[in-house]
Every structure is written in C-alpha cells, then in structure tokens.
C-alpha cells in the first residue's frame, strides 16, 4: 500500500477520505487506527456503527469521527480541532471477523496555524471586530508519498 499524505492546519478540522470497492467490502464494518511505530500494531481509534446498515451514522471518539458511504465506497474520517500530537501514520481498515484489511495508509501532517499569534511573528491576525468564529474552514491537502520517502524517522 502506498501512503497518502493529508495536511491540515492546527486548530481546524481535517477530513480524510478512503475510497474502496463497495462490493468487495460489502457488509464489512470499517475502522480508523493509528500506527504505533514503523512495525508496531495499529491502535483502533474509532470504528463504524456496530450494525453495518447504520454505517452512515457518524460515530465519534473524542475529536475523531468516522462515517461510511457503503454504496459509494468512501470511508470518511474527520479530525476536529487538529493538534500537533495528531500528526502520524494511520490506516483505514475494513473489518472481517477479528481481522482487518488495510484500505489506505494515511500520513497526517499538521501545519502551524498562520493566524495563531503565538507563532505568527509579524503575520497579520484578526482584531476583535474581525473574528473568524463563524467560519467553518476544513483544510485538507492530500498527496501520495514519493518513492523513498518514509513516514517514520529511521531507527538505529
């Protein structure tokens, strides 16, 4: 599996999509897990509804949500209020029995918020009358890792 990179801005929401063959994975629940180390286990973060027919219902675990379009074949994960510690390698999974097939490997990268005055330096940020409170910006940039790129730093 190639790894797809999704970039999001700290404090905002990031939406990750995982396409799959809807017939091949018919009837199977899905999950989103976080890879612990390069060869470590993938720790379950959140999974779709226990009843596959209700997979379209959004399920939350903390700030992470999952929903599955089982007809269209797209699993969508939303990471709300993205934080630097959310960066890392994840997997979208299709569950059968106690086993899981990897649908997509995802590298989440968290970019500093250019409007955050703690890091902004001389960057402009809004004053009291220019608040973005009502804005719901979902920033998602994705790309595939280039050959030779590694999602984890090499270990000695």
């Amino acid at each position: 599996h190639n790894t797809t990179v999704f970039q999001g801005v700290a404090g905002q929401s990031l939406q990750v999509s995982c396409p799959y063959d809807s017939m091949k994975h018919w009837g199977r629940r899905k999950a989103w897990c976080r890879q612990l180390g390069e060869k470590g286990p993938c720790q379950r973060v959140v999974s779709t509804h226990n009843l596959w027919l209700l997979s379209f219902l959004r399920r939350w675990n903390g700030s992470t949500a999952i929903t599955d379009d089982t007809l269209g074949g797209t699993l969508t994960i939303t990471l709300r209020n993205l934080q630097p510690h959310d960066a890392g390698l994840y997997q979208c999974q299709s569950l059968h029995g106690s086993e899981a097939d990897t649908l997509r490997k995802v590298l989440v990268e968290v970019l500093a918020d250019p409007l955050d005055h703690r890091d902004a330096g001389d960057l402009w940020f809004p004053g009291e009358s220019e608040s973005f409170e009502d804005a719901h910006v979902e920033h998602s940039i994705s790309r595939s890792l280039l050959e030779g790129e590694i999602p984890f730093p090499p270990t000695s």
Epitope: D21, M23, K24, W26, G27, R28, R29, L51, W52, L53, L95, H96, G97, S98, E99
Partner: antibody, heavy 123, light 107 residues
Framework: EVQLVQSGAEVKKPGESLKISCKGS????????IAWVRQMPGKGLEWMGT????????RYSPSFQGQVTISADKSISTAYLQWSSLKASDTAMYFC????????????????WGQGTLVTVSS | DIQMTQSPSSVSASVGDRVTITCRAS??????LAWYQQKPGKAPKLLIY???SLQSGVPSRFSGSGSGTDFTLTISSLQPEDFATYFC?????????FGQGTKLEIK
C-alpha cells in the same frame, strides 16, 4: 439460481500439472470471494485459500501457500485451482465455495458450494 | 491458527430424538462460527452462521448457540434426512479452520 459448477474428475500421475475450474452463475461472480476447500478421503474440510474475482486479490492458507495457485477470470465467471507438480498426497475432493458476508456480524461464510472435483494422483 | 474441536466424533440417535453437538475453539472467536451439514458424496451445506442465525431454507429444528470458545448445534427432533456429518467452522481469522466433524448415525 446461484450455482457453482466444477470441472470433472481427474486422474493424474505424480509430477504432472493440473488446473481445475469452478464456474459461477446466477449472481454477480466478480462481487463475491470464492474459496477452495480440500477434503481428503474420509477426512475433514481444509480451507486452502480464497480469491476476489473483481481484482484477483488472493489469500492462501499457510499450509497451501506455494503448493497451489488460485486464480480467476471474471470475464467468464470462473475460478481456478492449479498445481504445477502433483503429489500422491494431493489425492482428494476439492470444493469451491462462495463466501458471503453477512452484515449482521461483518464476517463471511460459505453459502453456496460446487459439487466437488475428485483428483486422484497415482503412479 | 485457531483449532476447532468437535465432540462427540460420532453419535447414534433415533428419529425424533434431540441431539446436541459441541464445538470448542482454541481461542475466543466471538460469535464468528458456522455449522455445515455434509452427506456422503455431496458438498457441505450451510446451516447456521454467526453462531445462531439460521440460513435461509434450513428447517427450524436446527439451532445454534454459544459465543467465545464454546458453541452448540442442536437438532430438536431428528428427521431421517438429518443423518449426516456436521462440521463447525470459525470465521474469526485466516486461515479459516473447521472442526474434524461429527457423524450422526441411525441407532
């Protein structure tokens, strides 16, 4: 009506190659996994492996990995099981079976079976 | 691999009897278990899936129960056509594995 029809009985000599088939009809063949199951004379059932004809994704039991090859041609709704060099111990009945995922529990079970192909390997 | 152990290996019973066959998994498999019936010279037939769900077209005298490691198949009132060999199979993980079979014979 869902049907899996397997090729006829085969008598072979050790070292010979063989390819048996399983043709599906009455359903969307490329949308269901097809498994192969071995039953040696008077014995139980052994899962050999499975293939998804839609993209030829294949999984093997460690006991059969490297011993057989599972393939499929979705254009003619047929799955295959082949050996490059048969042994006397390959003498058995071979069944193909459709794997159906039941959404109640997100796992799959063998809901339709072929009639079986008897393979006899003897010098 | 998960080992599936059936007991008894064979059982003799009469038409109208209630018969119970057990299947034990070497590790927990939740409810991911199926039961099949096989008659001589024929392919297996799915009876029960997900430990207790009756496959379409299977008579209601067949029932399944259990979860984790211990499972049972019960035939409430044996009919002449029920004399066959029965296999359990785990659908928890690959490779899929079957029990060794229980032969149900006429007493």
């Amino acid at each position: 009506e869902v049907q899996l029809v397997q090729s006829g009985a085969e008598v072979k000599k050790p070292g010979e190659s063989l390819k048996i088939s399983c043709k599906g009809s009455g359903y969307s063949f490329q949308s269901y996994w097809i498994a192969w199951v071995r039953q040696m004379p008077g014995k139980g059932l052994e899962w050999m492996g499975t293939i998804y004809p839609g993209d030829s994704d294949t999984r093997y039991s460690p006991s059969f990995q490297g011993q057989v090859t599972i393939s499929a041609d979705k254009s003619i709704s047929t799955a295959y099981l082949q050996w490059s060099s048969l042994k006397a111990s390959d003498t058995a009945m071979y069944f193909c079976a459709r794997q159906r995922t039941f959404f109640y529990d997100s796992s799959d079970y063998f809901d339709y079976w072929g009639q079986g192909t008897l393979v006899t390997v003897s010098s | 691999d998960i080992q599936m152990t059936q007991s008894p290996s064979s059982v003799s019973a009469s038409v109208g009897d209630r018969v119970t066959i057990t299947c034990r998994a070497s590790q927990g498999i939740s409810s991911w278990l199926a039961w099949y019936q096989q008659k001589p010279g024929k392919a297996p037939k799915l009876l029960i899936y997900a430990a207790s769900s009756l496959q379409s077209g299977v008579p209601s005298r067949f029932s399944g129960s259990g979860s984790g490691t211990d499972f049972t198949l019960t035939i409430s009132s044996l009919q002449p056509e029920d004399f066959a060999t029965y296999f359990c199979q785990q659908a928890d993980s690959l490779p899929r594995t079957f029990g060794q079979g229980t032969k149900l014979e006429i007493k």
